[in-house]
Interface confidence: medium
């Protein structure tokens, strides 16, 4: 169709090699948002503070970490953003009323082993999945 | 050790079946937070509104959906929370200054197919992963 042809002619004016999701990612030092970008933060969780000291034998706590920060346009390459997050970021940037920004959440989690008493006071060693944040990203 | 034995005795007084990290999840209908819980919301993304109409041939847009809502203590079972999110929710509940609440993010995403012009004005049909939110959860 003429429309397609017109669009095809327009399209050919764009620069080459604007690769993929990496592209989002160029203006790393954009001043468009002043808040700290999405990243992993320190967090030590004490089982005593959670009131779990009577049934968790070991460890006494663990380095859990947590994710916090902005997922603002443009998304930098280290933000591990999904395609949906990139689209949502752009939708938010163009019209903030439509949707919130994507949120900063764990992209990789590790397990920890916990020694605890079960309901019959047996000592159990169990591996708990997804307990420690290894990496954060925009989702 | 005496400490372990003491803790074991204490443990036996606690209610049964408090299996590990599931514990945080019990009070399904808690009134502790009035804001709407984490869930999937409607979002239609128009490629014209994003300014992509000149190189995306089809579709004109797509139902992308997005995730929004509270991830407050206690986390309900349908919130697809990770163990880390359950721990973080509890830490936040006990001391809100320590960490933010977990955030509401996609837990399952689907692909869409897009017909578009590449840099040489060839028409390309490609499947793009992680474009549509299928389910949301607390992370």
């Amino acid at each position: 169709s003429t429309g397609s042809k017109q669009r095809s002619q327009n399209r050919s004016k764009t620069p080459k090699n604007q690769e993929a999701l990496r592209m989002a990612n160029v203006a790393e030092n954009s001043s468009s948002d002043q808040r700290q970008a999405c990243k992993k933060h320190e967090l030590y969780v004490s089982f005593r503070d959670l009131g779990w000291q009577d049934w968790i034998i070991a460890p006494e706590g663990y380095a859990a970490y947590y994710c916090e920060g902005e997922c603002a346009f443009p998304l930098n390459s280290y933000m591990n953003a999904t395609n949906h997050a990139i689209v949502q970021t752009l939708v938010h940037f163009i019209n903030p009323e439509t949707v919130p920004k994507p949120c900063c959440a764990p992209t990789q989690l590790n397990a920890i082993s916990v020694l605890y008493f079960d309901d019959s006071s047996n000592v159990i060693l169990k591996k708990y999945r997804n307990m420690v944040v290894r990496a954060c990203g925009c989702h | 050790s005496t400490g372990s034995k003491q803790r074991s005795q204490n443990r036996s007084k606690t209610p049964k079946n408090q299996e590990a990290l599931r514990m945080a999840n019990v009070a399904e209908n808690s009134s502790s937070d009035q804001r709407q819980a984490c869930k999937k919301h409607e979002l239609y993304v128009s490629f014209r509104d994003l300014g992509w109409q000149d190189w995306i041939i089809a579709p004109e847009g797509y139902a992308a959906y997005y995730c929004e809502g509270e991830c407050a203590f206690p986390l309900n079972s349908y919130m697809n929370a990770t163990n880390h999110a359950i721990v973080q929710t509890l830490v936040h509940f006990i001391n809100p200054e320590t960490v933010p609440k977990p955030c509401c993010a996609p837990t399952q995403l689907n692909a869409i197919s897009v017909l578009y012009f590449d840099d040489s004005s060839n028409v390309i049909l490609k499947k793009y992963r992680n474009m549509v939110v299928r389910a949301c959860g607390c992370h």
Epitope: N10, R11, K13, T14, P15, Q18, E19, A20, L21, R22, M23, A24, N25, V26, A27, S30, S32, F73, P74, L75, N83, I86, V87, T89, L90, F93, I94, N95 | S46, F47, R48, D49, L50, G51, W52, Q53, D54, W55, I56, V114, Y116, D118, D119, I124, K126, Y128, M131
Partner: nanobody, 124 residues
Framework: EVQLVESGGGLVQAGGSLRLSCAAS????????MGWYRQGPGKQRTLVAR???????NYADSVKGRFTISRDNAKNTVYLQMNSLKPEDTAVYYC??????????????????WGQGTQVTVSS
């Protein structure tokens, strides 16, 4: 790379009008949104108005009904018509462009580009 050149700023009395222009050059075809931010003395840079190449617009509450953003896609130029100007509109006005694209390996946006800024002063 996208270069943005602003013009049309100046000194005007309260109640007067100005028209700002911003022309994009370089790889301007891939621009999918353009707009204006402003920064008053000692203040943060805030959105004034933006328009996509598809024609969708949105405005800061403080300028609704007084400012109009428009775009000439053929010239890769965005305009900001400012009427009923107030002293609180005094600021440096920055043009910006959002540049984005899809490719065979993924989905994404390139980034945002900014002009050098043009001074608008509204005297009472």
């Amino acid at each position: 790379e996208v270069q943005l050149v602003e013009s049309g700023g100046g000194l005007v009395q309260a109640g007067g009008s100005l028209r700002l222009s911003c022309a994009a050059s370089g790889s301007a075809f891939s621009i999918n949104a353009m707009g204006w931010y402003r920064q008053g003395p000692g203040k943060q840079r805030t959105l004034v108005a933006r328009i996509t190449s598809g024609g969708s617009t949105n405005y800061a509450d403080s300028v609704k009904g007084r400012f109009t953003i428009s775009r000439d896609n053929a010239k890769n130029t965005v305009y900001l018509q400012m009427n009923s100007l107030k002293p609180e509109d005094t600021a440096v006005y920055y043009c910006y462009a959002v540049h984005s694209k899809l490719s065979t390996t993924g989905w994404g946006t390139i980034g945002d580009y900014w002009g050098q800024g043009t001074q608008v002063t509204v005297s009472s």
